[in-house]
């Protein structure tokens, strides 16, 4: 049920031990009683007791102290449950039997007579505290108190409320005295079923299933679920939003695992040639003469340059190289001539020209013909005039470069440039790099292109040393020192040959 | 909403050609560079090529060098892979991707990926 109705009888006399018809009990009135607690009716009248009714064993004889009792036969106070709203108001007949049967069961034994009766009608909150009162009659007097409390798990003026706390699935809460939940430590919601994440998880990337946890949800990963987990392969690169790739300063490629600077980090050029990081590798080397390879790390043959004259033939030395030369030459290159026009030197139509009175000769040669008697066909390619990779084809008494994809010009010498399209903002400075173009920016502006106005201009405190030029970087904080000839570190604070004690990007 | 969507993968066998389309919507197609990347199962992804915004710029992974060509149309937004010689090794899922700016540095978003099977 939802309350209980408590009736506490606290002592009942009759002294003269009298029925209510006037007559006297023999030997003496065995006293037990009835209760009848209906719905409040301004006159009380019989029928059923609507809100319940309770009989006593026999309690004593003529005048008695009733005693608290809370088990077994006889308990006090008398209970009467009801599993229905409390309404507020009520009726209570209280009636005083004599018995002269058994004292457990009164009610069943034939011969019971009326002693007294009270009525009482009236209102009665829900509530702790009893009710005292007391009736009586000529013959007799009753006194009682009484109350209306809620059963376990019903709270309410009406104990209409039903709360019950648990710690499961479904809930986690005590009862407040008005039915109302208190939530165990951890727990939130309506019903106390939601529980309170680690302080900080993340509201979006982050849930729980149980207090103090944090579960992050795919994309994301941290203590508190606020960092996101870049794209699967991202070498140099972070993200701000899940499975992003954003490469590091200096990094290129879909997934940053190509280093813009290579030439810096890696120093792949051998033998004093130039790199430049640029070309399909992120890197190209221009070799000094006598190199070559991908690195210029190849010696090329001494002959490679074809230093003899006039058809001689050329053998490789240890360190240097000799001439053989043909009949009518000598020298080192095989420069002079023991010929003279007499002999017809001049091939392929040269006509010859003496010099120093008869004793040598020069041939002027015809188109496409060189060599000291004009015995070469000219070769327009052999001066490798094509840069940047570009094909040399020769097209009779012309050649032509075939440009490799990105290159353009006679020798395929300018790029096809990303800077074409001014991508730089604020006057910035366009560097067309393999993977795209990077600008440096003036002083006061930053970002990719230069978009980003600094309010706190980096370079503005003078912050590199020796004549260096200051740049801003990326962020609004970061500068970058240029340094003079002579002087290396990150703010070219320091003569080279006095190296830093700590790494540093030039 | 950017969207790539590839498509043109495929059943080939060894020695065989494939081209692949990647078609763009959703932001200014030639302002951005577009690439190619692959995954085989239980193995890494590996970035295979890309072109930068002007189509000035492409590179390519030496594993895929002299096979593969990239090209894109910035007129129909779309952007091709022509794979020739195929091998068993190239199967894989292929995405196209873009890292949202003119130069190949990163990935910002990517398709949904086709299947190419090359099996004799």
């Known amino acids: 049920g939802s309350g209980i109705f408590q009736l506490r009888l606290q002592e009942f006399v009759n002294q003269r031990g009298m029925l209510a018809n006037g007559q006297s009990c023999e030997p003496g009135c065995r006293t037990f009683f009835r209760i009848c607690l209906k719905h409040f009716q301004a006159t009380f009248s019989e029928g059923p007791c609507t809100f319940g009714n309770v009989s006593t064993p026999v309690l004593g004889t003529n005048s008695f102290v009733v005693r608290d009792k809370n088990s077994g036969s006889g308990r006090n106070p008398l209970q009467l449950p009801f599993n229905f709203t409390w309404p507020g108001t009520f009726s209570l007949n209280i009636q005083a039997w004599h018995t002269p049967g058994d004292d457990l069961r009164p009610e069943t034994s034939p011969g019971n007579s009326l002693i007294s009766q009270i009525i009482i009608q009236g209102s009665l909150a829900v509530g702790k505290i009893w009710r005292t009162d007391e009736q009586n009659d000529t013959l007799t007097r009753l006194s009682y108190s009484y109350r209306v409390i809620c059963s376990d798990n019903y709270y309410g003026e009406s104990c209409s409320r039903l709360c019950k706390k648990r710690d499961d699935h479904f809930g986690h809460y005590e009862c407040q005295p008005d039915g109302s939940l208190s939530c165990l430590p951890g727990w939130t919601g309506k019903y106390c079923d939601q529980p309170i994440c680690l302080s900080g998880c993340h509201e979006q990337n982050g849930y729980c299933s149980k207090p103090d946890e944090c579960i992050c949800r795919p994309g994301w990963q941290g203590r508190l679920c606020n960092e996101c987990i870049p794209h699967n392969g991202c070498r140099h690169g972070t993200c701000s939003i899940p499975w992003q790739c954003a490469c590091d300063e200096g990094w290129g490629g879909l997934f940053c695992d190509q280093d813009l600077n290579y030439c810096t980090h890696h120093s792949p050029c051998k033998n004093g040639s130039t790199c430049s990081n640029s070309g399909p590798k992120g890197y190209t080397c221009t070799c000094l003469p006598g190199y070559t390879g991908e690195h210029c790390e190849l010696g090329l043959s001494k002959c490679a340059s074809n230093p003899c004259r006039n058809g001689g033939s050329c053998k490789d030395q240890e360190n240097s190289y000799h001439c053989l030369c043909p009949p009518g030459y000598y020298g080192q290159h095989c420069e002079h001539s023991t010929l003279t026009c007499a002999d017809s030197p001049c091939f392929n139509g040269g006509s010859c020209r003496e010099r120093n009175q008869g004793s040598s000769y020069a041939c002027e040669c015809p188109p496409n013909f060189t060599g000291s008697n004009c015995e070469k066909k000219v070769d327009r390619c052999t001066s490798n005039p094509c840069a940047n990779g570009g094909q040399c084809q020769n097209r009779g008494p012309s050649r032509t470069c075939r440009c490799r994809p990105g290159f353009t010009g006679t020798h395929c010498e300018l790029h096809i440039s990303d800077c074409a399209r001014s991508p730089c903002a604020h006057g910035g400075t366009c560097h067309d790099l393999e993977n795209g173009p990077v600008c440096t920016c003036p002083a006061g502006f930053s970002g990719r292109r230069c978009e980003v106005r600094i309010t706190h201009d980096a370079c503005a405190s003078g912050p590199c040393f020796n004549g260096a030029t200051c740049y801003t970087g990326l962020s609004p904080n970061n500068f970058v020192c240029n340094c003079p000839y002579g002087f290396v570190g990150s703010r070219c604070e320091f003569p080279v040959g006095l190296p830093p004690s700590f790494p540093w990007v030039a | 909403e950017v969207q790539l969507v590839e498509s043109g993968g495929g059943l080939v066998q060894p020695g065989g050609s494939l081209r692949l389309s990647c078609a763009a919507s959703?932001?200014?197609?030639?302002?951005?560079?577009i690439g190619w990347f692959r995954q085989a199962p239980g193995k890494e992804p590996e970035g295979i090529s890309c072109?930068?915004?002007?189509?000035?710029?492409?590179y390519y992974a030496d594993s895929v060098k002299g096979r593969f060509t990239t090209s894109r149309d910035n007129a129909k937004n779309t952007v091709y892979l022509q794979m020739n010689s195929l091998k068993p090794e190239d199967t894989a899922v292929y995405y196209c991707a873009t890292p949202g700016i003119a130069a190949c540095r990163g990935i910002h978003y990517t398709g949904q990926g086709t299947q190419v099977t090359v099996s004799s």
């Open positions: 072109i930068s915004s002007s189509g000035g710029i492409t």
């Open positions: 959703g932001f200014t197609f030639d302002d951005y560079a």
